[in-house]
């Protein structure tokens, strides 16, 4: 089974090396999740041609997947540590329902999908410890998430393949933006 960062023997500090700082641990954790996403994307792209043709096959995408915007304070121009951290945590919490959706979407990478989901939960906990303004973080409504999950799972095979591709692509972009922002904190 895939191991989370910190469980791997290579992560155990050598006698004279410095233990990982909180920021380094978060950085490593995000890179671990990104590796998992790459593996899942590989399976998705091998299974269908969604990866090449998704743009021209869709008129509209109403999935409301979290996305970084200028106002979120995570970009170099207008960078704001507190606002950005709230956006990252809120975005990850919003992605959780989509990561739950991914759980039964993979054959050969089933464990990898579970690892991405679990390590995202751990990442949220790491970041919540770092955040000063926890009151500003809105948690998605469980009932809304449940009905969204039902709706996504009721789609036909083609739409489910497309949904899977879009979730993985958006999650990758969100994590890459988060990683860049967190390195400035």
């Amino acid at each position: 089974a895939p191991v989370l960062p910190g469980e791997d023997s290579k992560d155990v500090a050598a006698p004279h090396s410095q233990p990982l700082t909180s920021s380094e641990r978060i950085d490593k954790h995000i890179r671990y999740i990104l590796d998992g996403i790459s593996a899942l994307r590989k399976e998705t792209c091998n299974r269908s041609n969604m990866c090449e043709s998704s743009k021209e096959a869709l008129a509209e995408n109403n999935l409301n997947l979290p996305k970084m915007a200028e106002k979120d304070g995570c970009f170099q121009s207008g960078f704001n540590e507190d606002t950005c951290l709230v956006k990252i945590i809120t975005g990850l919490l919003e992605f959780e329902v989509y990561l739950e959706y991914l759980q039964n979407r993979f054959e050969s990478s089933e464990e990898q999908a579970r690892a991405v989901q679990m390590s995202t939960k751990v990442l949220i906990q790491f970041l919540q410890k770092k955040a000063k303004n926890l009151d500003a973080i809105t948690t998605p409504e469980p009932t809304t998430n449940a009905s969204l999950l039902t709706k996504l799972q009721a789609q036909n095979q083609w739409l489910q393949d497309m949904t899977t591709h879009l979730i993985l692509r958006s999650f990758k972009e969100f994590l890459q933006s988060s990683l860049r922002a967190l390195r400035q904190m």
């Epitope: 869709l58 008129a59 009721a154 789609q155 036909n156 083609w158 739409l159 497309m162």
Partner: nanobody, 124 residues
């Protein structure tokens, strides 16, 4: 399930107009994105136009932009395709399709429900 029945096809001269209708029955019509596709003999089924759930947004294939207009009347559970400036290459069997999904596709595999089709022939 959703049942779709198209009507309004026929023979028309180049430059003429036709209005296709698609009547839906079954589930809550306003939840569905509704589309028109067409299939000419020996060719693949191709996207023509789609209208979003509430009817706020419409999308068209480049080949029909400016000539065809898709609209819907949720009170009547009907979607329309107004076709103007018809050309011989518009000759095809026109199908109505529906889907309830956050994704609105331009690919036929993105739709769950289909009508039987109505034939449009553009000829002088």
């Amino acid at each position: 399930d959703v049942q779709l029945v198209e009507s309004g096809g026929g023979v028309v001269q180049p430059g003429g107009s036709l209005r296709l209708s698609c009547a839906a029955s079954g589930r809550t019509f306003s939840n569905y994105a509704m589309a028109w596709f067409r299939q000419a003999p020996g060719k693949e089924r191709e996207f023509v136009a789609v209208i979003s759930y509430a009817g706020g947004r419409t999308y068209y294939a480049d080949s029909v932009k400016g000539r065809f207009t898709i609209s819907r009347d949720n009170a009547k559970n009907t979607v329309y395709l107004q076709m103007n400036s018809l050309r011989p290459e518009d000759t095809a069997l026109y199908y109505c399709a529906a889907v309830d999904s956050p994704l609105i596709a331009t690919h036929p595999r993105g739709y769950d429900y289909w009508g039987q089709g109505t034939l449009v022939t553009v000829s002088s």
